[in-house]
């Protein structure tokens, strides 16, 4: 119910979170769960817990396996796991695909390429960035804030892209790279004032208390490469990442189609385990780009399990 | 929807001992821990302790861990708060509650409707 | 165990004033709950997590403070903000309450 998979390379720093959420005051405690042994918490190890988080610096083959957190609220534990896998850095320029993390689209008007998991480390700008292996240069390439801008993009843009970054630990610097794909959608077209497809306006869903449950924001901007378009949720007018219910994600990226010729974006909302609260929350499927924004609300219901007689 | 719903009050003798019920509905009654919380005129509110329904587990005030005991059905999604060893100290409105977000610690957001225990001879 | 203390322990207000009530903690808290409670009902959350609004609460009221000194504002007082509020730390066990204020309407 609570574990997460991470995975990094020897010699990297990695960072993982914990799984399972608690006020930033709560105590938590790292345990490696084969031995039961406890993750120290002082900064000179070189695997060490420090809250929330769990920080290989650098990480190694051996560190490999589930790791237990324990959130210490007032009243009771609450326990999570995070799965690590360490892997050997590879000889050549092929990044396998385990070490990929979710494959973005971008077009000839909107090619940002997001670093993975950046958000977890202390680094500083400017990023850099690999195709295949090779050190992007020229003009058409900006490395701006956590993500890679490529100007007048075309299909041949396609491929693997790597960000390197330096996280740095009490003066100590540390290499971390994540690779994920890019894809490019190529085609001449127009934009117009953004058409939610999914869900319709004001559309009650029904769901299961106690099961999983998906909502796909869809909207459509018009026809071929659009430029500045987005979709994105919110719950109560509050934005995914900062409500602060870790049951309640949005899908990483956004997925991009193409519907009878127009460009199209989709934005999965998933509820984990939902729970009665859930029902007396607003979700909101917002669509915008340059034209404007356009918003469909959506509530959920509660739907019965049928009862199966035998 | 959430409901906590409470049994009846109570007219107990001194010395005795009454349980009093909490059945939940509209959630996953494993999923949360449920607290119960003692209110009278001269001591306000006091938190008693607190269950967690999956495991059994419990945490008590101090105060009245010779007072009480939490236990919890899951069968019937039903939690209970025996009170033991009544004196007149002991009358009072005896609440169910939980918390909105279980691992948020986020107040009490679901209280019943309360149960009134008369302690008197 | 954490000691809350409330004050004032009564108060009165005229519609439209602007009404301030404290809740001192004996040690640091991380976070202040505040509770409503009217005669013959149960407390209703009101206030979480120091200034978050609880559904249906009226946006005229509003909660700050940190370590050990809290409060709960009303910015314009209407004749149904008349109850007793009780604030409330879930820093550490025991969870622990105010005594509570009670607020009149003048």
């Known amino acids: 119910k609570f574990s997460k998979q991470s995975w990094g390379l020897e010699n990297e720093a990695l960072i993982v979170r914990c799984p399972r959420q608690g006020k930033p005051s709560y105590t938590v405690d790292w345990y490696y769960s084969q031995t039961n042994k406890s993750i120290p918490t002082q900064e000179r190890n070189r695997v060490f817990a420090s809250g929330q988080l769990l920080k290989f610096l650098p990480a190694a083959v051996a560190d490999s396996g589930i790791y237990t957190c324990i959130v210490r609220s007032p009243t009771f534990n609450r326990t999570g796991y995070a799965n690590v896998t360490i892997y050997k850095k590879q000889s050549d320029c092929n990044v396998p695909d385990y070490l990929m993390y979710s494959t973005v689209s971008g077009s000839e008007k909107n090619s940002k390429i997001y670093c993975p998991t950046i958000d977890l480390y202390n680094w500083t700008a400017p990023l850099e960035w690999f195709k295949n292996c090779q050190a992007l240069q020229g003009s058409r390439y900006r490395a701006h804030k956590s993500f890679l801008v490529i100007d007048n993009v075309m299909t041949e843009d396609a491929g693997d892209y790597t960000c390197k970054f330096i996280h740095n630990e009490n003066g100590a610097n540390y290499s971390v790279t994540a690779t994920r794909s890019f894809t490019v959608k190529d085609e001449q077209g127009f934009s117009l004032f953004p058409v939610i497809g999914a869900p319709a306006q004001n559309e009650i869903k029904e769901v299961e208390i106690g099961k999983n449950a998906n909502l796909t924001c869809s909207a459509c901007f018009g026809k071929g490469t659009q430029f500045l378009a987005a979709v994105l949720w919110q719950l109560n007018g509050t934005k995914i990442t900062d409500f602060g219910e870790p049951r309640i994600q949005q899908e990483e990226g956004q997925n991009q189609s193409f519907s009878n010729g127009l460009a199209c974006l989709d934005m999965v909302l998933r509820i984990a385990d939902v729970k009665e609260e859930d029902l007396l929350l607003q979700y909101d499927c917002l669509a915008l780009n340059l034209h404007g924004l356009r918003r469909h609300t959506v509530r959920l219901s509660r739907k019965n399990p049928i009862d199966h007689h035998s | 929807q959430v409901q906590l719903q409470q049994s009846g009050a109570e007219l107990v003798r001194p010395g005795a001992s009454v349980t009093l019920s909490c059945k939940a509905s509209?959630?996953?009654?494993?999923?949360?821990?449920l607290h119960w919380v003692k209110q009278t005129p001269v001591h306000g509110l006091e938190w008693i302790g607190t269950?967690?329904?999956?495991?059994?587990?419990?945490v008590y005030n101090q105060k009245f861990k010779a007072k009480a005991i939490l236990t919890a059905d899951k069968s019937s999604s039903t939690a209970y708060m025996e009170f033991r060893s009544l004196t007149s100290e002991d009358s009072a409105v005896c609440y169910c509650?939980?918390?909105?977000?279980?691992?948020?610690?986020?107040?009490?957001?679901?209280w019943g409707q309360g149960t009134l225990v008369t302690v008197s001879a | 165990q954490i000691v809350m203390t409330q004050t004032p322990a009564i108060m009165s207000a005229s519609p439209g004033e602007k009404v301030t009530m404290t809740c001192s903690v004996s040690?640091?808290?991380?976070?202040m709950h505040w509770y409503q409670q009217k005669s013959g009902t149960s407390p209703k959350r009101w206030i979480y997590?120091?200034?978050k609004l609880a559904s249906g609460v009226p946006a005229r009221f509003s909660g700050s403070g940190s370590g050990t000194s809290y409060s709960l504002t009303i910015n314009n007082m209407e004749a149904e903000d008349a109850a007793t509020y009780y604030c409330?730390?879930?820093?550490?066990?025991?969870?622990?309450f105010g005594a509570g204020t009670k607020l009149e309407l003048k």
């Open positions: 997590d120091t200034s």
């Open positions: 409330q730390q879930w820093n550490s066990s025991p969870l622990t």
């Open positions: 040690s640091s808290v991380s976070y």
């Open positions: 509650t939980r918390a909105f977000y279980n691992d948020y610690d986020d107040g009490f957001a679901y």
């Open positions: 269950i967690d329904p999956e495991t059994g587990d419990t």
């Open positions: 509209g959630y996953t009654f494993t999923d949360y821990e």
